[in-house]
Amino acid sequence: EDGGPACYGGFDLYFILDKSGSVLHHWNEIYYFVEQLAHKFISPQLRMSFIVFSTRGTTLMKLTEDREQIRQGLEELQKVLPGGDTYMHEGFERASEQIYYENRQGYRTASVIIALTDGELHEDLFFYSEREANRSRDLGAIVYCVGVKDFNETQLARIADSKDHVFPVNDGFQALQGIIHSILKKSCIEILAAEPSTICAGESFQVVVRGNGFRHARNVDRVLCSFKINDSVTLNEKPFSVEDTYLLCPAPILKEVGMKAALQVSMNDGLSFISSSVIITTTHCSDGS
């Protein structure tokens, strides 16, 4: 791993990669792009999946947080032999399948999809791809697209969440390395700290949640601070203020000393959550302290 910027966010990251015939001589550049990017997501709570598509979609590596499995998944990715059509919708379907089944007892981890393609999608294939990307979104995913060479930016803006979620690489495959930093910056949603991290039992407080990417939501009005109390009850609170690097949130009143609230953030009104290892604990505060 080459140091530099990293992402500490806990979410599910799906790479949906074009392996159609047109990328045959550029697979190495795609592989190195994914490998470099994958190493920059370093939270132990981050899970990753590799999906490739041509005439059909294939899940090369199912969602996993296991770094050894990710290493093996990258090895499998390197061995891919491109060929076939550009059925991007098949890739989205494989992602949606996993997202669907990650819904546990009404709780779903936030999903980020990075889809890479090199060509223009012909009419029907574009329609199918947009439809399947919409479904992934309805299941709680944030969708980014990387377009290389002969892509249609208007199409990709409709498949991705917005024009701002598209990364155009106009200078060919070798230029993929050059967008790693900007993709990391845009796709990373992370919770780094809470201030204060200790609050008085039974009292109302405001918490500043420090992190990055909080304004990457499609609609900032849908951002929520979430407090998972003692690993059981979850309370969602609407932030007073949403900035890219911090949220100002009302903290729930925790009545007893020693209670712990794990901090999570939802970008979509509680449909899915970004997890963190940030904990707020309660303590006894005497009058005047």
Epitope: G57, E93, R94, E97, Y100, Y101, N103, R104, R131, N134, R135, D138, L139
Partner: antibody, heavy 121, light 107 residues
Framework: EVQLVETGAEVKKPGASVKVSCKAS????????MHWVRQAPGQGLEWMGW????????NYAQKFQGRVTMTRDTSISTAYMELSGLRSDDTAVYYC??????????????WGQGTLVTVSS | DIQLTQSPSSLSASVGDRVTITCRAS??????LNWYQQKPGKAPKLLIY???SLQSGVSSRFSGSGSGTEFTLTISSLQPEDFATYFC?????????FGQGTRLEIK
């Protein structure tokens, strides 16, 4: 041939629990999610939840949370659905169904033959 | 949760008739809709998946169409074995839900 065979009919008293089993054959048991669906007499179909036979992870419909437990025994390719705190309106046929996976994922096929659970005092 | 409403709830028809059953979703579900046939005392059987794809082994007189919120199941020429109850099912987003069913009887 892919087959799901469920246990025979059960009669239970209100407040009791029932455990229905579903034996799978003709495919790799751990390769496909298993769902449970029930149907009260003369009524429609109601999805109850699923189990991932590989990991044992589950997801239950909100209505059944706290009362239903889905488990599996991979050594005998069998899935189980236990429903506790039975009430008369739990009288239904309980089906185990397999998700065939892509490209037909969540289009249930095949279905078990069903287990009739009657709750009566 | 996404609600599915089938219409009609029941209908009478004769052998050879063309029959259409409608399923309406409370919000758009793309093409994530399946159709099942159920005969008395039997488990449901998958007929159509993804709104219009015919399950293997199912007669081609069954067809499905629609997208978004409105879907139809059509039986082009009713056969005696088609008299049964038909259910639609959405799998667009959890929880999975079913229509209330349409009972098809012999006139």
């Amino acid at each position: 041939e892919v087959q799901l065979v469920e246990t025979g009919a059960e009669v239970k008293k209100p407040g009791a629990s029932v455990k229905v089993s579903c034996k799978a054959s003709g495919y790799t048991f751990t390769g496909y999610y298993m769902h449970w669906v029930r149907q009260a007499p003369g009524q429609g179909l109601e999805w109850m939840g699923w189990i991932n036979p590989t990991s044992g992870s589950t997801n239950y419909a909100q209505k059944f949370q706290g009362r239903v437990t889905m488990t599996r025994d991979t050594s005998i390719s069998t899935a189980y659905m236990e429903l506790s705190g039975l009430r008369s309106d739990d009288t239904a046929v309980y089906y185990c169904v397999r998700d065939p996976g892509s490209p037909k994922w969540l289009a249930f096929d095949p279905w078990g033959q069903g287990t009739l659970v009657t709750v009566s005092s | 949760d996404i609600q599915l409403t089938q219409s009609p709830s029941s209908l009478s028809a004769s052998v050879g008739d063309r029959v259409t059953i409608t399923c309406r979703a409370s919000r758009a579900i793309s093409r994530y809709l399946n159709w099942y046939q159920q005969k008395p005392g039997k488990a449901p059987k998958l007929l159509i998946y993804a709104a219009s794809s015919l399950q293997s082994g199912v007669s081609s007189r069954f067809s499905g169409s629609g997208s978004g919120t409105e879907f139809t199941l059509t039986i082009s020429s009713l056969q005696p074995e088609d008299f049964a109850t038909y259910f639609c099912q959405q799998t667009y987003s959890p929880p999975i839900t079913f229509g209330q069913g349409t009972r098809l009887e012999i006139k």
